[in-house]
Interface confidence: low
């Protein structure tokens, strides 16, 4: 039968920032440069993340914690822990294989990321367009025409700032 170990694993005494070195009688050795261990009892240290290319260092690696990256200007983070960088576009644009392209008429994007989305169809909710949409902004839906019958409190739509679907370049 297999005898259970009554002695505590000596590696469990090794704190974060060290590893249990089997080559040195399980002595707790400091993590080598560019590596870390974030918990105690580790038998190896993990290699630090390198922020390279479009990534830049937000937090340096230490013996107990990994480096953290963000994205160089003109790009933004995606994914857990900024695992990805995506190119920024202007509002009113979306990213395609051939770079940033203006939103097609009838669509908008109010952010520097993501894709152009269709304007809201106010009539589906029985409402009217209060403010026309642009490449950067969705339409604003107002009360339905029936709500604007004589005697009801009227709403004067503000003049659109620019022609629908056109953005200043």
């Amino acid at each position: 039968f297999e005898r259970t170990r009554s002695l505590q694993d000596p590696c469990s005494n090794c704190p974060a920032g060290t590893f249990c070195d089997n080559n040195r009688n399980q002595i707790c050795s400091p993590c080598p440069p560019n590596s870390f261990s974030s918990a105690g009892g580790q038998r190896t240290c993990d290699i630090c993340r390198q922020c390279k290319g479009v990534f830049r260092t937000r937090k340096e690696c230490s013996s107990t914690s990994n480096a953290e990256c963000d994205c160089t200007p003109g790009f933004h983070c995606l994914g857990a822990g900024c695992s990805m960088c995506e190119q920024d576009c202007k509002q009113g644009q979306e990213l395609t294989k051939k770079g940033c392209k203006d939103c097609c008429f009838g669509t908008f994007n109010d952010q520097k990321r993501g894709i152009c989305r269709p304007w809201t169809n106010c009539s589906l909710d029985g409402k009217s367009v209060l403010v026309n949409g642009t490449k950067e902004r969705d339409v604003v839906c107002g009360p339905s025409p029936a709500d604007l019958s004589p005697g009801a409190s009227s709403v004067t739509p503000p003049a659109p700032a620019r022609e629908p679907g056109h953005s200043p370049q």
Partner: nanobody, 124 residues
Framework: EVQLLESGGGLVQPGGSLRLSCAAS????????MSWVRQAPGKGLEWVSS????????YYADSVKGRFTISRDNSKNTLYLQMNSLRAEDTAVYYC?????????????????WGQGTTVTVSS
């Protein structure tokens, strides 16, 4: 861990050629579109070329069209960029990039993994 490792950069005279390679690991290479992006000294990142997952569709920036050819060997998990008729303005660090799948169709993409880059210097 997803990794991209570029090689093949170097010093070349104007009019010369270079072939860049990008060895991919840690993901199913044949499932993803790939790109080459470059950064000239003191300038921003510039998209150079993309290739779809199968290798059937390729895309090029106007500045390299007719001179550069992107290709891939899915059996070797490797992306290539054949650069001919090189010019001084092609001097840059060239990055291999894996494209993610955040868009709604093939016309949208993002880059989610970058290599460390390989330097191409075109000078006489």
């Amino acid at each position: 861990e997803v990794q991209l490792l570029e090689s093949g950069g170097g010093l070349v005279q104007p009019g010369g050629s270079l072939r860049l390679s990008c060895a991919a690991s840690g993901f199913t290479f044949s499932n993803y579109a790939m790109s080459w992006v470059r950064q000239a000294p003191g300038k921003g990142l510039e998209w150079v070329s993309s290739i779809d997952a199968s290798g059937g569709d390729t895309y090029y920036a106007d500045s390299v069209k007719g001179r550069f050819t992107i290709s891939r060997d899915n059996s070797k998990n490797t992306l290539y960029l054949q650069m001919n008729s090189l010019r001084a303005e092609d001097t840059a660090v060239y990055y291999c990039a894996k494209e993610g799948s955040h868009g709604t169709d093939d016309s949208h993409y993002d880059v989610d993994v970058w290599g460390q880059g390989t330097t191409v210097t075109v000078s006489s």
